[in-house]
């Protein structure tokens, strides 16, 4: 008769590192003590006639255990296969590109270390909770990849990797491990450069707005803008409106920046850069400055008028050009009464990058001369009727401007000048009209002939 040696449990499944109670039994009546053959750590717990119980501890890997016993002149054996399940020690999604261009493929790569049995282990790649790929874990470590076409919707989306150890057929459930999520950043950066609006010329110590615009940018809020005049970074205000980015700054030129310069606008997104450059000439345009040798000249004195401006500036003083650009223009005159209040005009012209810039300046000359009463404006003989209204039209000139008073000879009676007054017979007589200033006096005799009115 053939006797059997039973091993229980048959083909058990247990968690890695766990323990297992094994019972070996036979119905052989003359059996010896049962031995357990395994590489696992074992301990005999109890035994009796035809049976032995063992405890296996720290079961770390799949193993075949064998029980052997001597029975009726032969050795009989029984076996059981232990399947160990182990959750993956590491489930990690490889770092994603820092920025991914929309419309281009990128690879999701998940690494799974450990985890068994491999035949029950599946690796799932996810976007949010959407499955992108489901593959069996094969090698050790297992590496699972999926190619994804980046879209705008993927910006900020979490990608993760999940392992599923399916021990449901063994009645143990589905064990899930999920990696830490990684966020993808996608972007669109058009091939076209930004539009840069900047002045062609910029005068030293003056300010001018500079605008830089780029359309079709995503996400516009993540873009970085660099605006500079030469090597001087400009403080830009950046505005986003949809997929359009606008940076505005004020460019102020310094004296040390004079000459040909560039305004640069860099827009950086996703590690890529678009650049626009515009040429700009920084110029210095001093003047024109018009000078009088004597701002207030005495009649008969010589006055020099000069006009000067910065280097490369052509000046013209009262139509007379300077000998060369950068040189002053001058004229001399003998100051006369007619020059009082005369304005001298200077125009300056600077050529900047093929364009001509014009500036004007003027100065007024004051000539000091003595008082005069213009006989043409002051009639020396007046015939007026009694009891009528009249104006003594007399005008004096001079610099400083003279005071004009008309006094009746032999009395202190004064008639107003330039103001209407009521005439009567008492106004009849000779008047001394005197213009006086710090420069002297000028007297003109005016006779007033007052006709008495007819008596009715």
């Amino acid at each position: 008769q053939e006797f059997l040696l039973r091993v229980e449990p048959q083909n058990p499944v247990l968690s890695a590192g766990g323990s297992l109670f094994v019972n070996c039994s036979t119905d052989c009546p003359s059996s010896e003590k049962i031995a357990l053959e395994t590489s696992l750590s074992k301990e005999l717990v109890a035994s009796g006639m035809g049976w032995a119980a063992f405890n296996l501890s720290n079961v770390t890997g799949n193993s075949r255990i064998l029980c052997s016993v001597y029975c009726n002149g032969s050795q009989i054996t029984g076996s059981s296969n232990i399947t160990v399940y182990r959750l993956p020690e590491r489930v990690e999604l490889a770092p994603l590109p820092p920025w991914q261009p929309v419309g281009q493929n990128f690879t999701l790569r998940c690494q799974v270390e450990d985890g068994s049995p491999r035949t029950s282990l599946t690796v799932v790649l996810l976007r949010w909770e959407e499955e992108l790929s489901r593959q069996p874990a094969v090698e050790e470590p297992a590496e699972v990849t999926a190619t994804v076409l980046a879209s705008r919707d993927d910006h900020g989306a979490p990608f993760s990797c999940r392992t599923e150890l399916d021990m449901q057929p063994q009645g143990l459930g589905l064990f899930v491990n999920t990696s830490a999520p990684r966020q993808l950043r996608t972007f669109v950066l058009p091939v076209t450069p930004p539009r840069l609006v900047a002045p062609r010329f910029l005068e030293v110590e003056t300010s001018w707005p500079v605008d830089c615009t780029l359309d079709g940018l995503f996400p516009a809020s993540e873009a970085q803008v660099y605006l500079a005049l030469g090597d001087q970074m400009l403080n830009a205000t950046v505005m986003n409106h949809g997929d359009t980015l606008t940076a505005t700054a004020t460019a102020t030129a310094r004296a040390d920046q004079e000459g040909a310069r560039e305004i640069v606008c860099n827009v950086t997104l996703g590690g890529e850069r678009r650049e626009a450059r515009e040429n700009l000439t920084v110029f210095s345009f001093l003047g024109p400055i018009v000078n009088l040798s004597e701002p207030t000249a005495h009649e008969g004195s010589t006055v020099t008028v000069s006009c000067m401006a910065g280097a490369r500036v052509q000046v013209t003083l009262d139509g007379v050009p300077a000998a060369a650009p950068g040189q002053p223009a001058q004229l001399q005159l003998n100051a006369t009464e007619s020059d009082d209040g005369r304005s001298f005009f200077c125009s300056a012209t600077l050529e900047v990058d093929g364009e001509f810039l014009h500036r004007n300046s003027s100065v007024q000359l004051r000539v000091l001369y003595g008082p005069k009463i213009d006989r043409a404006t002051c009639p020396q003989h007046l015939k007026w009727k009694d009891k009528t209204r009249h104006v003594l039209q007399c005008q004096a000139r001079g610099n400083p401007y003279p005071e004009l008073r008309c006094l009746k000879e032999g009395s202190s009676r004064e008639v107003p000048v330039g103001i209407p007054f009521f005439v009567n017979v008492t106004h009849n007589g000779t008047y001394q009209c005197q213009a006086s200033s710090s420069r002297g006096k000028y007297t003109l005799v005016v006779v007033m002939d007052i006709e008495a009115g007819s008596s009715h």
């Epitope: 010896e32 003590k33 031995a35 074992k42 005999l44 064998l66 001597y70 002149g73 050795q75």
Partner: antibody, heavy 118, light 107 residues
């Protein structure tokens, strides 16, 4: 009757290896477990390990894991033990002992004397 | 490893005596305890297995008792040929371990 015939004495140099044999007769070789025991001159007994010739399974005393290798040849009903990297500490009499279970030795060989000397 | 402690180390007897040899295990080994006799210049010989089971061909004056961790080998009516070293062996846990032995000598 059960008999275990062990090979003759061995003289070996330090660092060398020796392989001794134990031929079984009087029973079916694959039905018994074969144990190996060490005894140094004037000392007690030390279990080295066993082999089950039926399954070729070996169980070692951890102390001898890197020293002894147990094998069995079913066709010649002979068990072997190889000792490697010999030192003077390995000078001893080595016994084979068979039994109907894995837990003791019922039938003992006459022993093989191993002397390790430069 | 289970440590087996035998006492006494040496036992001087007179033929005809009844003697008891003691063996203690460092932990419970149930009845997995075996006794061996080794005469001078001879191989060991199994006397008792599993604490009390007698072995075919071994004189009936040899008997064993005990369970757990305390065991005894008794020899009734000691004979001069019983001189030698007696070893107990743990068979419960691997590695199998032997006691240091009790030397039986004649007075």
């Amino acid at each position: 009757q059960v008999q275990l015939q062990q090979s003759g004495a061995e003289l070996a140099k330090p660092g060398a290896s020796v392989k001794m044999s134990c031929k079984a007769s009087g029973y079916t070789f694959t039905t018994y477990w074969m144990h190996w025991v060490k005894q140094r001159p004037g000392q007690g007994l030390e279990w080295i390990g066993y082999i089950n010739p039926n399954t070729d399974y070996t169980e070692y005393n951890q102390k001898f894991k890197d020293k002894a290798t147990l094998t069995a040849d079913k066709s010649s009903s002979t068990a072997f033990m190889q000792l490697s990297s010999l030192t003077s500490e390995d000078s001893a009499v080595y016994y084979c002992a068979s039994s109907r279970d894995a837990y003791h030795g019922t039938y003992w060989g006459q022993g093989t004397l191993v002397t390790v000397s430069a | 490893d289970i440590v087996m402690t035998q006492s006494p180390a040496t036992l001087s007897v007179t033929p005809g005596d009844r003697v008891s040899l003691s063996c203690r295990a460092s932990q419970s080994i149930s009845d997995y305890l075996h006794w061996y006799q080794q005469k001078s210049h001879e191989s060991p010989r199994l006397l008792i297995r599993y604490a009390s089971q007698s072995i075919s061909g071994i004189p009936s004056r040899f008997s064993g008792s005990g369970s757990g961790s305390d065991f005894t080998l008794s020899i009734n009516n000691v004979e001069p040929e019983d001189v030698g070293v007696y070893y107990c062996q743990n068979g419960h846990n691997f590695p199998l371990t032997f006691g240091a032995g009790t030397k039986l000598e004649l007075k």
